[in-house]
Amino acid sequence: AQGKEVVLLDFAAAGGELGWLTHPYGKGWDLMQNIMNDMPIYMYSVCNVMSGDQDNWLRTNWVYRGEAERIFIELKFTVRDCNSFPGGASSCKETFNLYYAESDLDYGTNFQKRLFTKIDTIAPDEITVSSDFEARHVKLNVEERSVGPLTRKGFYLAFQDIGACVALLSVRVYYKKCPELLQGLAHFPETIAGSDAPSLATVAGTCVDHAVVPPGGEEPRMHCAVDGEWLVPIGQCLCQAGYEKVEDACQACSPGFFKFEASESPCLECPEHTLPSPEGATSCECEEGFFRAPQDPASMPCTRPPSAPHYLTAVGMGAKVELRWTPPQDSGGREDIVYSVTCEQCWPESGECGPCEASVRYSEPPHGLTRTSVTVSDLEPHMNYTFTVEARNGVSGLVTSRSFRTASVSINQTEPPKVRLEGRSTTSLSVSWSIPPPQQSRVWKYEVTYRKKGDSNSYNVRRTEGFSVTLDDLAPDTTYLVQVQALTQEGQGAGSKVHEFQTLSPEGSGNLAV
C-alpha cells in the first residue's frame, strides 16, 4: 500500500503569505512574484554572483512537528549557469545549503545561525544556461531530503546562499504515514512511519467482525516502513465458525449451510440425515434417531447404530462351539462395525444361570471383534450355554438400546471316564474305566496314556475299543501316571483324571493282587 503524506509546510500553496525571515535583512534572498498560466507564483530568489563572499540566509517560519518523527523536504528550484554571467563571475556558485533547527518555541525574528544543523548541500541536476534564460525556458530541479528523528515541538528550515543565482519555487515539508489497511481479514490502523530507515515499526492488526486468529496461528501483524509502505505481513485472521469470507468481510453461512471451525473454506451444505440449519450455523443437528460420534467431522452425514447381526449359528464340537454370523443388514451408515460376544451358562439341575466369561476361552478377545466368527472352548459337559453377539458402531454408545442376536447350545461332550486299578503285578497294571451308558455309543475308541512318575520326557499311548487294558513291561515298585480319554467323531472327549498307580515290589509277591 502506497504511503500517505501529511504536509506540514507548503510554500507554493501559501501564495506568498508565509513571510519568511531573511538574513541579513534587505540583502540576499528576496520574495518575488511571477505570472505562470495566468496564476501568480511566488519564489524566493538570490543572485549576488558578482560580489564575493556571500552568506545569505532564508529561514522558514516555525513549523509545528505534531506527530511526525521523520520529515521529508521537497525542494523545487532553478540555478543559473555561472558561465552565463560576464567574466564567469569568479565568486559565482551553483549550489546552496539546507539547514534545520529544532525548538520547543518560536524564536520569532531572533535568528541565530549557530542553532542550525546542516542537512545537505543542494546541487542542481540541471542548470539554466543563457539561451534557456533568454527564451524564458528555465530548468526546474526537484530534490528531496529527509531528517529524523525529530523530538522537539517544532522546527525551522533555513537555506544558505553562498553566491549562487537561485530561485526557490517550492518548499514542501511533510511526513509519511502507513495508511489504514484491510488485509487478511485484519484491520491495520493508520500508522506514523518510523524515523529510522533500517527499522520497521511492528503494528498489530485486529480481526474484522466474525473473524478470529486460528488456534495455534499467529496474531496478524504488519510492518510500517519509513516510506509509509506496509511490508512483511505476518499471521492472519480467518472467518469464525458459522461465517465465510466474502471479499474483505466475514458473512454468516446461509440457512442450510454450516461451517464448523475457523478456516479458509467456505460454508458447506448440511450433510445427509441432518435438519436444515439456521443462518450462521456451526453444525447441522442430526435428525431424530441419527447421531454424530465425538470423533465424526461435522461434514459427515449423521448415522445410527447398526441392526443386529443378520444370522447367527452355533455349532458344537465336543467342548467347543463355533459361532458364526453375518453382518447387520443396516450398517447405520457407518463402516466402523465391531462385534461383542457374551456368554451365559445355565446349570440344568437348578436352572440357575450366570455369566461364564471367566470359565470359557475365546479364540480371540470377544469384545471389539471385526471378524464374523469366533470359537469358544473349555465348555463344561451337560451345561446349557447362551451366546449373545452384539453389533456396535461409533454411535452405539449414544443410545441405550442394543442390537444383538442370541444362540443357545447344550454341551453333550462325553464325561471323563472313571478309572480304576483292577490288578497289578511287579511289571503290569490292569486298568478299567466306565462312562455313562447313554454316551458309550458315541465313543469309537479309548486312548490310554501312561508314563513313569517323575519322567516327563517320554510317555506311552495305547488305544482300545474296550473298557479295560493291561499295561505290560513296567518296572517293579514304580508309580505310573495313567490317563484315559474317549475319542468321538467330534474329536477328543473329556480326559479322565491323571491317576497314580504303583506296580508291586519284587518282595511283595502275590500276582495281580490289589
Epitope: L421, G454, S456, T479, L481, A494, V498, L504
Partner: antibody
Framework: QVQLQQWGAGLLKPSETLSLTCAVY????????WSWIRQPPGKGLEWIGE??????????NYNPSLKSRVTISVDTSKNQFSLKLSSVTAADTAVYYC?????????????????????WGQGTMVTVAS | SYVLTQPPSVSVAPGQTARITCRGN??????VHWYQQKPGQAPVLVVY???DRPSGIPERFSGSNSGNTATLTISRVEAGDEADYYC???????????FGGGTKLTVL
C-alpha cells in the same frame, strides 16, 4: 482323631535359621507325606515341601523356589517332623503351618500325590527383623 | 510352573449362591481341593477330589471341575461363610503342590 502340635522360635534376625517342629498325635505316622505350608501376612498359602518315611528311607520333595534353603526331617520314634529354613530374610516373615494329607500316599497300588490336607497345625508366626 | 488363577473377591447376598472359580491349564485332569480360612485361623478343607466333602462340611458346599476351570459353589450363603477360599492341586510336571491366590468371599 489325629492332631498336629507345632512349636519353634517366633523371632529371628536376618541370616539366621528358622527351626520348627510338628508332633503328630492320635494316628499313624508312616505312609503319609507330611507337609509344611506358610502364609505371609495378608497373602496366600505357599507350599514349602513334604517328607514321607518309608522303610528306612526318607522321601523329600521341596518347592523349587525354596529348595536351596529348606530341609525337612523326621523323627519316627517321636512321631515328629521338622522344618529348617536357612539364611532367612524379612521376606520369610509368615505364619508357618504343618499339615497332614487326607489319605496315605499309596494304598493297594493307588497313590495320591498332592492329596488334600485335612488336618492342620495351629500355626506359628515367625517374624524376621533386625 | 503351573499357575492357578482365582478372582480376588466375590460378593453375594445372604441366601444366594456364590461361585468361586479356579482356572488352570487342563485343570479337569487334576483333582482339585478347596479350603476355607477365616481370619486368624488355620485353613479348613471343605471339598476334595473336585466334589467330595469331608465329614462335618454342610451339603451347601459343592464343587465341579472340567476343561480349564474348577468351581466351588456355596448355595444358600450364610454370614458365617464369609472367609478366604483357596484351591489346590498337584502339578504332575514339577511334582509339587500348587495353591491358587485365594478369593475373599464377602456376604453383603
Amino acid at each position: 482323631q489325629v492332631q498336629l502340635q507345632q512349636w519353634g522360635a517366633g523371632l529371628l534376625k536376618p541370616s539366621e535359621t528358622l527351626s520348627l517342629t510338628c508332633a503328630v498325635y492320635g494316628g499313624s505316622f508312616s505312609g503319609y507325606y507330611w507337609s509344611w505350608i506358610r502364609q505371609p501376612p495378608g497373602k496366600g498359602l505357599e507350599w514349602i515341601g513334604e517328607i514321607n518315611h518309608r522303610g528306612s528311607i526318607n522321601y523329600n520333595n521341596y518347592n523349587p523356589s525354596l529348595k536351596s534353603r529348606v530341609t525337612i526331617s523326621v523323627d519316627t520314634s517321636k512321631n515328629q517332623f521338622s522344618l529348617k529354613l536357612s539364611s532367612v530374610t524379612a521376606a520369610d516373615t509368615a505364619v508357618y503351618y504343618c499339615a497332614k494329607p487326607l489319605r496315605p500316599h499309596c494304598t493297594n497300588g493307588v497313590c495320591y500325590s498332592g492329596d488334600a490336607f485335612d488336618i492342620w497345625g495351629q500355626g506359628t508366626m515367625v517374624t524376621v527383623a533386625s | 510352573s503351573y499357575v492357578l488363577t482365582q478372582p480376588p473377591s466375590v460378593s453375594v447376598a445372604p441366601g444366594q449362591t456364590a461361585r468361586i472359580t479356579c482356572r488352570g491349564n487342563n485343570i479337569g485332569s487334576k483333582n482339585v481341593h478347596w479350603y476355607q480360612q477365616k481370619p486368624g485361623q488355620a485353613p479348613v478343607l471343605v471339598v476334595y477330589d473336585d466334589s467330595d466333602r469331608p465329614s462335618g462340611i454342610p451339603e451347601r458346599f459343592s464343587g465341579s471341575n472340567s476343561g480349564n476351570t474348577a468351581t466351588l459353589t456355596i448355595s444358600r450363603v450364610e454370614a458365617g461363610d464369609e472367609a478366604d477360599y483357596y484351591c489346590q492341586v498337584w502339578d504332575h510336571s514339577s511334582d509339587h503342590v500348587v495353591f491358587g491366590g485365594g478369593t475373599k468371599l464377602t456376604v453383603l
